[in-house]
């Protein structure tokens, strides 16, 4: 058998297979050796006794969208059944005091892979022999703590396959240079060592994608916005929009990157070298935000030039291989190509709450002594869209234990003026964050206010 | 001068439903909150829910939580309170109040009767 | 059974003084403001006393409202016959997050 028939149906064309070779990769017409590495296909009776207790479940993610020249990342993580886990010599064991369907286990390894590599090992002097070899028959990799790794993964995408030994948790890197754009499928499947040979455990799938196009996404965060992520905002306050591009392999570290936006509120064009930027949007309604972030990023060089018709027919000076106008192509060229990330929202802006002031605090007079507690009344005053809701939240005076957290319904008058009353349990220094709400904004302020003894004669105030 | 005017009143059978409506004059709608409060035959004064000027807020009470539902029309100053799975125990006058802390102005009821 | 607790009755005789008192707790009458309603016979409520203390215009001065921690009490002075009515108490609560009334008091004035 050939790994492609191993490996999956999802053969790509003849271009493919002769054009985007992946660095280390290697051909999936090489041949499987199926003495080591049954195969089974799904729905085979044997996956269900693959692994003692259970099925491993292998998860496969990857830091895709990639942009066409960086690198993708893809990991394997192994699931293994409840109570199981990889010790730190690469064996599986069972997890102390930790029980499953089987109740507690009286060996403690799932598989001791040290006892089996120590008793079967019959090698030649090198700690090479016939069995640690991968499924193409390439020797496993001695690097230091090998025989700790006990699964081989092998990895499938494009018409070709990458191999590696690992333990219950690996990573690749691809760069994706020679990958078609668009979306493309990556297959893995696990084995694990038995005796000198391995059984498949797991196979799992995922899309990855690559791309000619910067991946941009924007925060955008507002003071006194109350839901940042429903893109409604508030008008009168400056929004400040925050790029994030996602570039995982860094591909783009030493680009400069130039940003340029249009806001859809007739402010015209913005230009800017920094990734956050804001604006103030002075009208209610909806925008149209557009952005486009621009990348200068290592990339093909262009084709040369054809070479100038010469007036009159000369002898050919040799086959074309020789033009000496081709020996620029060389490939080591570092040649730069302008990369483009799009980014567009909608955003609607509406009345909110722009501020909110305590302008007056007050100690309430009580017709009957009440030496526990002080009533305490706030005249708020604010600016901007009606408030539907108070909040006031009593804490130490370092703003950081909350005591009392009370929210209420509150009718404001035009003038948006309130008075929020408030019970203080006893004298002492409080911090109070006020809070006035509506459907869209949620506006803070703060004071630390001295509650005195309920002497008539200690006067209320504001500590600094 | 303030004015509520409550309406769509009526006999229902258990589970049925019925629309309240509320027209309100003599003040700027679309800056007030707007709350309904009813009153069982013989009974004391139930709050049943509040909305917030623009209708983005919007309160009930345990007892009509996911049958009862406030809204409001600003263009028309209207309030309403739609009354699905109705009951027995929904029987009351159904009053129309302005604002939610304090119930400043008060409609004259319109009487909801639930009855097989 | 209401979250605010009133005496479902109490009585005077005309220019006496009466209070009605209204007991809740730190999530309402304690940090929300209290206010009282009238309701005449066959009519709808009438709002007598808001934030507490404070009266709209058009309501007698013989109504008065107080609060005390946890307590709130509306005290009429100089009663009349036309007095006669339910009253009620009522405030928000921050915790069922819900406007709660008391049971309502019955006052009759005697003689």
């Known amino acids: 058998k050939r790994f492609h028939d191993v490996l999956g149906n999802e053969r790509p064309s003849a271009y493919m297979r002769e054009h985007n070779q992946l660095n280390g990769w290697s051909s999936d017409e090489n041949d499987w050796n199926e003495k080591l590495y049954p195969v089974w296909k799904r729905g085979d009776m044997r996956w269900k006794n693959s692994w003692k207790g259970g099925r491993v479940q292998a998860v496969l993610t990857s830091d895709s969208p990639a942009l066409v020249g960086s690198n993708i990342t893809f990991a394997v993580n192994l699931i293994f059944p409840r109570c199981q886990k990889e010790d730190a010599n690469g064996n599986i064991v069972y997890e102390k005091n930790c029980r499953n369907e089987a109740g507690l286990s009286a060996d403690p390894y799932v598989y001791n892979w040290t006892a089996w590599s120590e008793d079967s090992d019959g090698e030649n002097g090198t700690g090479q022999s016939h069995h640690n070899v991968f499924p193409d028959g390439k020797p496993f990799p001695h690097h230091p703590g090998w025989r700790r790794w006990n699964f081989i993964y092998v990895f499938h995408t494009l018409g070709q396959y990458f191999q590696k030994l690992g333990r219950c948790s690996v990573r690749v890197s691809v760069n994706t240079a020679n990958v078609t754009l668009g979306p493309q499928l990556m297959e893995v499947t696990v084995y694990r060592r038995h005796g000198r040979a391995y059984v498949p455990i797991a196979q799992v799938k995922d899309v990855y994608v690559v791309t000619d196009q910067i991946p941009v996404f924007v925060t955008m965060f507002q003071k006194n916005d109350r839901n940042s992520s429903d893109e409604t905002f508030l008008k009168d306050l400056p929004i400040m929009f925050d790029v994030l591009i996602h570039d995982p392999s860094h591909f783009l570290n030493y680009s400069t990157i130039n940003y340029k936006w249009s806001f859809g509120d007739n402010t015209g064009l913005f230009v800017s070298t920094n990734h956050t930027v804001n604006h103030t949007y002075v009208l209610n309604g909806t925008f149209s935000l557009n952005l486009t972030v621009k990348a200068a990023a290592p990339g093909p060089c262009p084709p040369p030039p054809p070479p100038p018709r010469p007036s009159k027919p000369t002898p050919s000076l040799g086959p074309a291989g020789d033009n000496p106008l081709e020996l620029s192509r060389i490939p080591d060229e570092n040649c730069q190509i302008n990369r483009y990330g799009h980014f567009q929202a909608t955003i609607t802006i509406v009345e909110g709450i722009l501020e909110v002031n305590i302008i007056q605090m007050t100690d309430v007079l009580m017709p009957v002594p009440w030496p526990e507690s002080s009533l305490i009344d706030f005249v708020v005053t604010c600016q901007g869209s009606i408030p539907t809701e108070v909040c006031t939240i009593i804490s130490d005076p370092t703003c950081e234990i909350t005591q009392n957290t009370v929210c209420s319904p509150v009718d404001v008058d035009e003038m948006c003026l309130l008075t929020v009353r408030r019970t203080f349990n006893g004298s002492g220094t409080y911090c109070v964050n006020l809070t006035l709400g509506d459907d869209t904004s949620l506006a803070l302020t703060s004071t630390l206010i001295s509650v005195p003894d309920r002497d008539p004669a200690s006067p209320l105030r504001m500590a600094n | 001068e303030v004015q509520l005017l409550e309406s769509g009143g009526g006999l229902v059978q258990p589970g049925g439903s019925l629309r309240l409506s509320c027209a309100a004059s003599?003040?700027?709608?679309?800056?007030?909150?707007m709350s309904w409060v009813r009153q069982a035959p013989g009974k004391g004064l139930e709050w049943v829910s509040s909305i917030s000027h623009s209708g983005g807020s919007k309160y009930y009470a345990d007892s009509v939580k996911g049958r009862f539902t406030i809204s409001r029309d600003n263009s028309k100053n209207t309030l309403y309170l739609q009354m699905n799975s109705l009951r027995a125990e929904d029987t009351a006058v159904y009053y129309c109040?302005?604002?939610?802390?304090?119930?400043?102005?008060w409609g004259q009821g319109t009487l909801v009767t639930v009855s097989s | 059974q209401s979250v605010l607790t009133q005496p479902p009755s109490a009585s005077g005789t005309p220019g006496q003084r009466v209070t009605i008192s209204c007991s809740g707790s730190s999530s309402n009458i304690g940090n929300n403001y209290v206010s009282w309603y009238q309701q005449l016979p066959g009519t709808a409520p009438k709002l007598l006393i808001y934030?507490?203390?404070q009266r709209p215009s058009g309501v007698p001065d013989r109504f008065s409202g107080s609060k005390s921690g946890t307590s709130a009490s509306l005290a009429i002075s100089g009663l009349r016959s036309e007095d006669e009515a339910d009253y009620y108490c009522?405030?928000?609560?921050?915790?069922?997050?819900?406007?709660?009334f008391g049971g309502g008091t019955k006052l009759t004035v005697l003689g």
């Open positions: 109040a302005r604002k939610w802390s304090t119930f400043d102005y």
């Open positions: 934030a507490d203390s």
């Open positions: 003599g003040f700027t709608f679309i800056r007030r909150p």
């Open positions: 009522g405030a928000w609560d921050s915790s069922l997050n819900a406007y709660v």
